[in-house]
Interface confidence: low
Amino acid sequence: YDFTNCDFEKIKAAYLSTISKDLITYMSGTKSTEFNNTVSCSNRPHCLTEIQSLTFNPTAGCASLAKEMFAMKTKAALAIWCPGYSETQINATQAMKKRRKRKVTTNKCLEQVSQLQGLWRRFNRPLLKQQ
């Protein structure tokens, strides 16, 4: 999917109001310095492409992120604010919410969500170089 025509400000608002807090909740108990950010993005469409990939595509050692609260809200935001992004995603999100069971959080998932936090920050802000 080409994210070029998304309403970035609306997606940004969704991230700031809810998704970011859900990401922090998922990472609770993990030091912010524990994982190095190895994934980056150059512009907002690229960032959304990377965010979608990390959030919804199962990877070795982390297959369950799509059922997390932040993922469901991300999917809803993309469905609402990205023209042509599959409208059925909202229905799929609701169905997922009903049958969702908490999975064991693996270290690989924590690392992946840490990367997601970095991508979202890059989407909303320049990649800050903390001194």
């Epitope: 700031l16 920050r121 802000r125 001194q131």
Partner: antibody, heavy 120, light 108 residues
């Protein structure tokens, strides 16, 4: 060490103009969204406006009371933030601070402030 | 327009716990930050993102935020904590909003 140093404040008559500067050091200035915040004598803090980093298009936003009169700009090559104030009013009298923004819209570093007095 | 409401003043006995509130419509959905300002000085960030402490800020400072109220808690209050405290949040209409400020007095 992060440092922000404002200059350019002073006494100006109503309707006049003034340009404030904020010299930044100790961090990669171009990466950050930068702000002006003011504080009238004995009053609270009031956000004036900001300028985004060039990677976020370098656009500006302003608080309603100053929109159309104040202009924020930046020179990343000089690590300097500016505030051009036109059509000044007596209610613009305040200490003006420049501030650096970090994640979640918080200001983690502030200058010492420069006093602007608008009086006839 | 979005408004943040703080009490004008709060008093606390030396060594006791001070709580400063900041009220706003559904403020729990926003990140809240707290600044300390001493007379003649620039503000200093003491809490950001509801409950995060910048480096150099004592663990005695903590924050919470839910519903319509955010709270700055200062444990074991010291004389040096006497200052004005401002809450701040971001709003999509008014951008960056500050509370009116709370004067904290430490009683001996």
């Amino acid at each position: 060490e992060v440092q922000l140093v404002e200059s350019g404040g002073g006494l100006v008559k109503p309707g006049g103009s003034l340009r404030l500067s904020c010299a930044a050091s100790g961090f990669t200035f171009s990466d950050y969204w930068m702000h002006w915040v003011r504080q009238a004598p004995g009053k609270g803090l009031e956000w004036v406006g900001h300028i985004k980093s060039k990677t976020d298009a370098g656009t500006t936003d302003y608080a309603a009371p100053v929109k159309g009169r104040f202009t924020i700009s930046r020179d990343d090559s000089k690590n300097t933030l500016y505030l051009q104030m036109n059509s000044l009013k007596t209610e613009d009298t305040a200490v003006y601070y420049c501030a650096r923004e970090i994640y979640y819209y918080a200001f983690d570093s502030w200058g010492q402030g420069t006093l602007v007095t608008v009086s006839s | 327009s979005y408004e943040l409401t703080q009490p004008l003043s709060v008093s606390v006995a030396l060594g006791q716990t001070a709580r400063i509130t900041c009220s706003g419509d559904n403020i729990g959905s926003k990140y809240v930050h707290w600044y300390q300002q001493k007379p003649g000085q620039a503000p200093v960030l003491v809490i950001y993102g509801d409950n995060e402490r910048p480096s150099g800020i004592p663990e005695r400072f903590s924050g919470s935020n839910s519903g319509n109220t955010a709270t700055l808690t200062i444990s074991r209050a010291q004389a040096g904590d006497e200052a004005d405290y401002y809450c701040q949040a971001a709003d999509w209409v008014d951008f960056y909003v500050f509370g009116g400020g709370t004067k904290l007095t430490v009683l001996f």
